[in-house]
């Protein structure tokens, strides 16, 4: 069963490490995917010092732990790197963080995947 | 720490229910997708079920479809498994496991028993 | 219906290297199966090793590596230690909701 579920068809793409990665620095990126397979948008980003500095934003793969997530919200308290995702064209344009008082360590922090 | 506890399980006849549970804790529940994973004796691992964040989105083996139902009380911080209609072929340790990104289960119950026999 | 096929069986000496594979009937696996391995000794829960290909698990040693090798997910055991043997599960993420085990490979340590 899944309620209420919105397809993810394009996000907003950001890549800090644009020049090194050569692709561009800012955009919309287009989700694609095998067609049985759903998509997300993500965001990745660093609290230095209170100033937020954005990783990457882009498409996600399938990945359950974003189903029905309409926001892109970070809750773990206080990662390295924080990390959230997202069902919805361009859910990832605003993102925030909620932390909710996670007491466990992650195996690791996500990165994006490779295409 | 992370601690996935399930109970429930025990000895039921052929067509009668359980209701499974799973207390997770050690981290932030509801914001964990969570699965539920069989072994049937001497057998290998089978995926059963598994849930999305809020519980509005559940999938099943096709073998169970029909028969359990997941769900969640993000305010319990609890999993549930509840099977119905059940089968000897169902006769298996249940673990309750969490999925963290890039869909994996990143820690494991100990499992309980299921048996179903006459 | 997608069938995901292990080695039933591996032997490997003590100190010695041993790659398992984990492959399916619908097409080559790749990383966006996001294969994860999992170990697993008579009557304890299983233990996570890799996910998402090739990133190890928090406190597993380095002798435990994930790769895809042509068509097939692996997992290579490198300086094999008696405690590694064990049965070992792969799991294909398929998608929407879906994953699907490996029938296993249970893993002799000669000697």
């Known amino acids: 069963a899944i309620l209420g579920r919105s397809e993810t068809q394009e996000c907003l793409f950001f890549n800090a490490n644009w020049e090194k990665d050569r692709t561009n620095q800012t955009g919309v990126e287009p989700c694609y995917g095998d067609k049985d397979k759903r998509r997300h948008c993500f965001a990745t980003w660093k609290n230095i010092s209170g100033s937020i500095e954005i990783v990457k934003q882009g498409c996600w793969l399938d990945d359950i732990n974003c189903y029905d997530r309409t926001d892109c919200v970070e809750k773990k308290d206080s990662p390295e790197v924080y990390f959230c995702c997202c069902e919805g064209n361009m859910c990832n344009e605003k993102f925030s963080y909620f932390p909710q008082m996670e007491v466990t360590q992650p195996t690791s922090n996500p990165v994006t995947p490779k295409p | 720490e992370v601690q996935l506890l399930e109970s429930g399980g025990g000895l039921v006849q052929p067509g009668g229910s359980l209701r499974l549970s799973c207390a997770a804790s050690?981290?932030?529940?509801?914001?964990?997708?969570m699965s539920w994973v069989r072994q049937a004796p001497g057998k290998g691992l089978e995926w059963v079920s598994g849930i999305s964040v809020t519980g509005g989105s559940t999938f099943y083996t096709d073998s169970v479809k029909g028969r359990f139902t997941v769900s969640r009380d993000n305010s319990r911080n609890t999993l549930y498994l509840q099977m119905n209609s059940l089968r000897a072929e169902d006769t298996a340790v249940y673990y309750c496991?969490?999925?963290?990104?890039?869909?994996?289960?990143?820690?494991w119950g100990q499992g309980t028993l299921v048996t179903v026999s006459s | 219906q997608t069938v995901v096929t292990q080695e039933p069986s591996f032997s490997v000496s003590p100190g010695g290297t041993v790659t398992l594979t984990c492959g399916f009937n619908?097409?080559?696996?790749?990383?966006?199966?996001?294969p994860s391995w999992y170990q697993q000794t008579p009557g304890q829960a299983p233990r996570t090793l890799i996910y998402n290909t090739n990133t190890r698990s928090s406190g597993v040693p380095d002798r435990f590596s994930g790769s895809i090798l042509g068509n097939k997910a692996a997992l290579t055991i490198t300086g094999a230690q008696a405690d590694d043997e064990s049965d070992y599960y792969c799991v294909l993420w398929m998608g929407s909701g879906i994953w699907v085990f490996g029938g296993g490979t249970k893993l002799t340590v000669l000697g």
């Open positions: 496991a969490k999925v963290y990104y890039y869909s994996f289960f990143d820690y």
């Open positions: 619908s097409g080559s696996v790749s990383t966006s199966y996001w």
């Open positions: 050690g981290f932030t529940f509801r914001n964990s997708a």
